[in-house]
């Protein structure tokens, strides 16, 4: 399920006629939170609801990916009258409730961020006492994880006609720019493929034909830093093999 507007519904009054105006369900989340990989981030989420003074059992849930259907990453339950929300699920033990659901706050802390955490998160609250009701953030909060470049793979591979090619794959956010340097190359952005489908933070650069022996260095750089790694090509002349 996809939602098209930022989820900042105001605390509208019910337009039906009541003896006293009732609060409506709404959830307030920021459109985006940014943090660096390795750090922690807080995903804010507060809500209003129409059930005055509800103190029955409640469950707080956060899911990732898409509302209503995405996998749960955190869940806790509070017994009637209790302000303690007992954690029932915390994916990889990295999710912790910061807010107090009894005070309409479902804010979540995510520890030890990784690039894979870069996605949208949706908060949900469920009442299961005399009142049976639930509500879920429709748009959610985008967790934007930034990271300095890291070269995850560098290799030399054989290609047709006894030639060789080099591949360099790096990750980072923003996606890093890759450059090759080496014998008779200077600096080259040789055949950058970026980003790979389903691997939004991975960038690959290929040197299609290594014509000289020697050291080939791949440099990855973005606004947060740079990283480099090298491979060595040494061909046994007169033979078809190579040492790297």
């Amino acid at each position: 399920f996809v939602r098209t507007k930022i989820d900042t519904t105001e605390n509208l009054l019910n337009t039906e006629v009541h003896s006293s105006p009732a609060q409506r369900w709404s959830m307030q989340v920021p459109p985006e939170v940014s943090a660096e990989a390795g750090d922690a981030a807080v995903l804010p989420c507060t809500f209003t609801h129409p059930h005055r003074h509800y103190d029955g059992p409640l469950t707080a849930i956060w899911r990732a990916g898409e509302p209503y259907a995405g996998p749960q990453v955190f869940r806790c339950a509070a017994a009637r009258g209790s302000e303690l929300c007992q954690t029932a699920l915390s994916l990889h033990g990295r999710f912790r409730l910061l807010g107090n659901p009894r005070r309409n706050d479902l804010s979540l802390r995510v520890e030890r961020l990784a690039l894979a955490d870069d996605r949208r998160y949706f908060c949900r609250v469920e009442f299961a006492g005399d009142v049976h009701d639930r509500y879920e953030s429709r748009h959610g909060v985008r967790l934007h994880v930034t990271a300095a470049p890291r070269i995850v793979n560098i290799s030399v591979l054989p290609s047709p006609a006894h030639a060789f090619r080099a591949l360099c794959t790096a990750e980072g956010e923003p996606p890093p720019a890759l450059a090759w340097s080496g014998p008779a190359l200077g600096n080259s952005l040789a055949a950058v493929r970026s980003p790979r489908e389903g691997h939004g933070h991975l960038v690959t650069a290929e040197l299609p034909a290594l014509t000289h022996d020697g050291r080939y260095t791949c440099t990855a750089a973005n606004s947060l830093g740079r990283s480099e790694a090298s491979v060595y090509l040494f061909r046994f002349h007169g033979a078809s093999g190579a040492s790297t």
Epitope: T4, L12, T15, E16, W25, P50, A69, E126, H132, R134
Partner: antibody
Framework: QVQLKESGPGLVQPSQTPSLTCTVS????????VHWVRQPPGKGLEWMGV???????SYNSALKSRLSISRDTSKSQVFLKMKSLQTEDTATYYC???????????????WGQGVMVTVSS | NIQLTQSPSLLSASVGDRVTLSCKGS??????LAWYQQKVGEAPKLLIY???SLQTGIPSRFSGSGSGTDYSLTISSLQPEDVASYFC????????FGGGTNLELK
Amino acid sequence: QVQLKESGPGLVQPSQTPSLTCTVSGFSLTTYHVHWVRQPPGKGLEWMGVMWSDGDTSYNSALKSRLSISRDTSKSQVFLKMKSLQTEDTATYYCARDHQDNGGYAHFDFWGQGVMVTVSS
Amino acid sequence: NIQLTQSPSLLSASVGDRVTLSCKGSQNINNYLAWYQQKVGEAPKLLIYNTDSLQTGIPSRFSGSGSGTDYSLTISSLQPEDVASYFCFQYNSGWTFGGGTNLELK
């Protein structure tokens, strides 16, 4: 009393983008949500999307790239546009009111009579 | 999304029979389940909501029960006008309909 009525072209050429209209009476679009549901001939019901009372929209993820829901509250109308219709989109299209009037969501308590859309060249 | 499986897909019964239709969810539905009746050429009509609440104007021979992932609709004494398709519908997490049960007279 609560009423919903769908209208739109009965016959649509493949790849066209028709607009269906749901005209409501007896309730306010700013208080209640309105959903769109479709049913191919002889088959089951498929939830398509919702116009929330606050003017927001949510869509079935399998259809989201082709759907657009909008509204005109002054005319008490909700619109469904679906891009690039194919023969498999031939169905009766219903709008239905969500029972919940407090911003939350619930079952659908009132339905329109439906409009049959046939996609054929 | 939550998937709903209805069984049987076709049910033949006699007038006066007690009839039970089943609906099973792929995950917990938390009692947010409704039942609709649909006659040929008509829009679906709400019978039961929140698992066991009877919609206003619906005969008391219709009743619903269940919890968790398993739910059922019971017609205590089948009448000729009950011949129709019946759909279950979950609204716990998003909105999903079951595939339907066609109820016919023997």
